[in-house]
Amino acid sequence: DSEEDEEHTIITDTELPPLKLMHSFCAFKADDGPCKAIMKRFFFNIFTRQCEEFIYGGCEGNQNRFESLEECKKMCTRDNANRIIKTTLQQEKPDFCFLEEDPGICRGYITRYFYNNQTKQCERFKYGGCLGNMNNFETLEECKNICEDGPNGFQVDNYGTQLNAVNNSLTPQSTKVPSLFEFHGPSWCLTPADRGLCRANENRFYYNSVIGKCRPFKYSGCGGNENNFTSKQECLRACKKGFIQRISKGGLIKTKRKRKKQRVKIAYEEIFVKNM
């Protein structure tokens, strides 16, 4: 794909609360791949905000592809029932908020956050980097949004809306206005290069989010993190071209890459998904 090719696209008005994805790949377009098999799979549709069926060709494609509807929901919705705002003031937390913190079996010593059901607060813990459970958040804010109660004892909704205590209406929460090209791609693309724990010297590439380029580094052969690719092309494909562009007001914007138009206007802010 030539990065010089550009297309102009127009934003459509679909009033929805701000979309907050569990995994960046949930924003990827359903991709049947180049092969010709007919395999029933599921993908998360950012427009309808639901997991839907599609036909997969059997090879390539992308990570927004699941064997079952349940798996899709588990990966791309915060909680299988989390779109329903309760008529009571207390919105249910996802089940995983009640799991104990779990470091997993590996030795990464990564700072993460978990909801402590004893103290009713999100707390820091050291995650080993593998296994563990879903009560594991990269930021304190994300943990609080999903698992902690709001100030008046009601749950903050995953889309940044709260149930108004007076009239049971949805009230938008104040949101920071993000920059035009804020990075919202795979979170591992933002992590620094990590040699890992072993003694090998393997040539790898990592995405340097400061300069926006893939750079070589020496990998030890074990441990480290996901910002680790065997080729520059693979690094670029995963990190350079998969981010979400956000703008604060509607209008016309240019998006690189010749591919089908994919646009959705969100209330309070717009999310633009660049096709992978």
Epitope: Q63, C106, G128, C130, N133, A200, G223, N228
Partner: antibody
């Protein structure tokens, strides 16, 4: 050199409990750099991970959803071993059961395997 | 769950030939947490590769590569003792899962 020695019955009746033990030599069940697992293998299902225990300041476990309601893996620090209990077995639980050590690079040490047949 | 799909199911090759075994994951797997095992009839599996490193005592003809969702085990020149079944396994996220295996048989 780390070794794992499995013991337990090879025949279990349907609805009963399958119990196997894995004795560890050359490492400690309480090691903070290892984890201890049970895996089974049957012709129909291939290699199937059942569960894992590990000690990181306290004991943790994780079980496969397919057996979660029926499985318990327990450490025995005094004997330096760990055990598998699988309740309410059916003929589908017939398999070769392996215990294995996970040393953060994969399952690097395996027990010899125990063929468990569930039959009346 | 992360589903690991191995291909081909069977690989028929002669000693001295190069074997390339594929393991494709249904979701992202951290490459450090993908392992390869060799199993011979009547024996327990044996760890060969973790990430792209060889386990202790594994000959240099075995190598692992790949990242993301596509991983490869390569045996550069097959020896008679290499004819066996090979499994990939991930422990990036719970539950731990194995591929269904690739049998490398003598042609």
């Amino acid at each position: 050199q780390v070794q794992l020695q499995q013991s337990g019955p090879g025949l279990v009746k349907p609805s009963q409990t399958l119990s196997l033990t894995c004795a560890i030599s050359g490492d400690s069940v309480s090691s903070s750099s290892a984890a201890w697992s049970w895996i089974r293998q049957s012709p129909g299902r291939g290699l199937e991970w059942l569960g894992i225990i590990y000690y990181r300041s306290k004991w943790y476990n994780d079980y496969a959803v397919s057996v979660k309601s029926r499985i318990t893996i327990n450490p025995d620090t005094s004997k330096n071993q760990f055990s598998l209990q699988l309740n309410s077995v059916t003929p589908e639980d017939t398999a070769v059961y392996y215990c294995a050590r996970h040393s953060m690079v994969g399952f690097d040490v395996w027990g010899q395997g125990t063929l468990v047949t569930v039959s009346s | 769950d992360i589903v690991l799909t191995q291909s081909p199911a069977t690989l028929s090759l002669s000693p001295g030939e190069r074997a390339t075994l594929s393991c494709r994951a249904s979701q992202y797997v951290t490459s450090s947490y993908l392992a390869w095992y060799q199993q011979k009839p009547g024996q327990a599996p044996r760890l060969l590769i973790y990430g792209s490193s060889r386990a202790t005592g594994v000959p240099a003809r075995f190598s692992g590569s790949g990242s993301g969702t596509d991983f490869t085990l390569t045996i550069s020149s097959l020896e008679p003792e290499d004819f066996a079944t090979y499994y990939c396994q991930q422990y990036s996220s719970s539950p731990i899962t194995f591929g269904q295996g690739t049998k490398v048989e003598i042609k």
